[in-house]
């Protein structure tokens, strides 16, 4: 039975040409996470495998660093990154769990929500 | 048009050490992870090991871990893969191969390099 | 490791035939398998990745199939140029490992 949740950043906003970082917790399973991929309306951004490490999709490596720990940071960003982003846990011996994260890139310097996320 | 072009034939006696190279062409090499595949005679593939030529990090098959070394160069877009302790066993063809874009398969490869190791 | 295993390890087959080649699995692998074409003296090409994607540039009678366990490459209608042995890999962990192995040739 998969009795885990995933927690993530939930709504995010921050500012053009700046980073932000994609964080997704799961918990409540004592499951064993063998790999995280991070999507960005299904197309692939980057994958954390347990014993491979990572794969950032080579049409994001100039922008996309891995980590801090399973998360993703994005950055110089454009309103184009405006969207839903998922992260997607492999877990053993549970399945599979489905995070969800909406990131809004903003002209202006509003980018009140998330703040703790973002990288100076 | 993608081009991996390795290096030449190498015989080799035991206990001696091998590099082989593999220099990339029709790509940027810093954004896509190169692995090394060997295939012993009349044997299924196996697979050696990983390497980001952009951060130079690399994972390797526990099997080959404490023999295999992979390293870039990143002026020349040549990554290499030496191999250490050789034994008769060590005797295959040795390719390189540039990770794929959504994962850790493999879409282009080598032309294969022979090494024998043999007394 | 993962295990692999396929079959069947060889066949004989005729121009125009439907091939049907099995990979199975040690482990839940979702979709991350690969498969392989390699003709002798030659590198290995890409097929398939992601179980059923089909990898840029081969003919559409090339398809997969499968996830968890147990995966299938099929091959409509065979032709004189796809006389090769096949391997499957799994790209879920360390190490990559790669079947044995199918080979088909001219019945």
């Known amino acids: 039975m998969m009795t885990g949740t995933i927690e993530t950043t939930g709504n995010i906003s921050a500012e053009k040409g700046g980073s932000i970082i994609l964080q997704c917790h799961l918990s409540s399973t004592t499951a064993q996470v063998t790999q995280v991929n991070w999507e960005q309306q299904d197309q692939l951004l980057a994958i954390c495998n347990a014993d491979l490490g990572w794969h950032i999709s080579p049409s994001f490596k100039d922008r996309v660093a891995p980590g801090p720990g399973l998360g993703l940071t994005l950055q110089s960003l454009t309103v184009n990154d405006t969207g839903e982003y998922f992260c997607i846990y492999h877990t053993y011996p549970d399945g599979t769990y489905t995070g969800r994260i909406f990131l809004e890139v903003l002209e202006s310097s509003v980018a009140e929500h998330g703040a703790r996320f973002q990288i100076p | 048009e993608v081009q991996l072009v390795q290096s030449g034939a190498e015989v080799k006696k035991p206990g001696a050490s091998v590099k082989v190279s593999c220099k990339a062409s029709?790509?940027?090499?810093?954004?896509?992870?190169m692995h090394w595949v060997r295939q012993a005679p009349g044997q299924r593939l196996e697979w050696m090991g990983r390497i980001d030529p952009d951060s130079g990090g690399s994972k390797y098959n526990e099997k080959f871990k404490s023999r295999v070394t992979i390293t870039v160069d990143k002026l020349s877009s040549t990554a290499y893969m030496e191999l250490s302790s050789l034994r008769s066993e060590d005797t295959a063809v040795y390719y390189c191969?540039?990770?794929?874009?959504?994962?850790?398969?493999?879409?282009?490869w080598g032309q294969g390099t022979t090494v024998t190791v043999s007394s | 490791d993962i295990q692999m295993t396929q079959s069947p390890s060889s066949l004989s087959a005729s121009v125009g035939d439907r091939v049907t080649i099995t990979c199975r699995v040690s482990e839940n692998i979702y979709s991350y398998l690969a498969w392989y074409q390699q003709k002798p003296g030659k590198s290995p090409k890409l097929l398939i990745y992601n179980a059923k994607t089909l990898a840029e540039g081969v003919p559409s009678r090339f398809s997969g199939s499968g996830s968890g366990t147990d995966f299938t490459l099929t091959i409509s209608s065979l032709q004189p140029e796809d006389f090769a042995t096949y391997y499957c890999q799994h790209h879920y962990g360390n190490p990559l490992t790669f079947g044995p192995g199918t080979k088909v040739d001219i019945k």
């Open positions: 029709g790509y940027t090499f810093t954004n896509y992870y």
């Open positions: 191969a540039r990770e794929g874009h959504y994962g850790f398969y493999s879409d282009y």
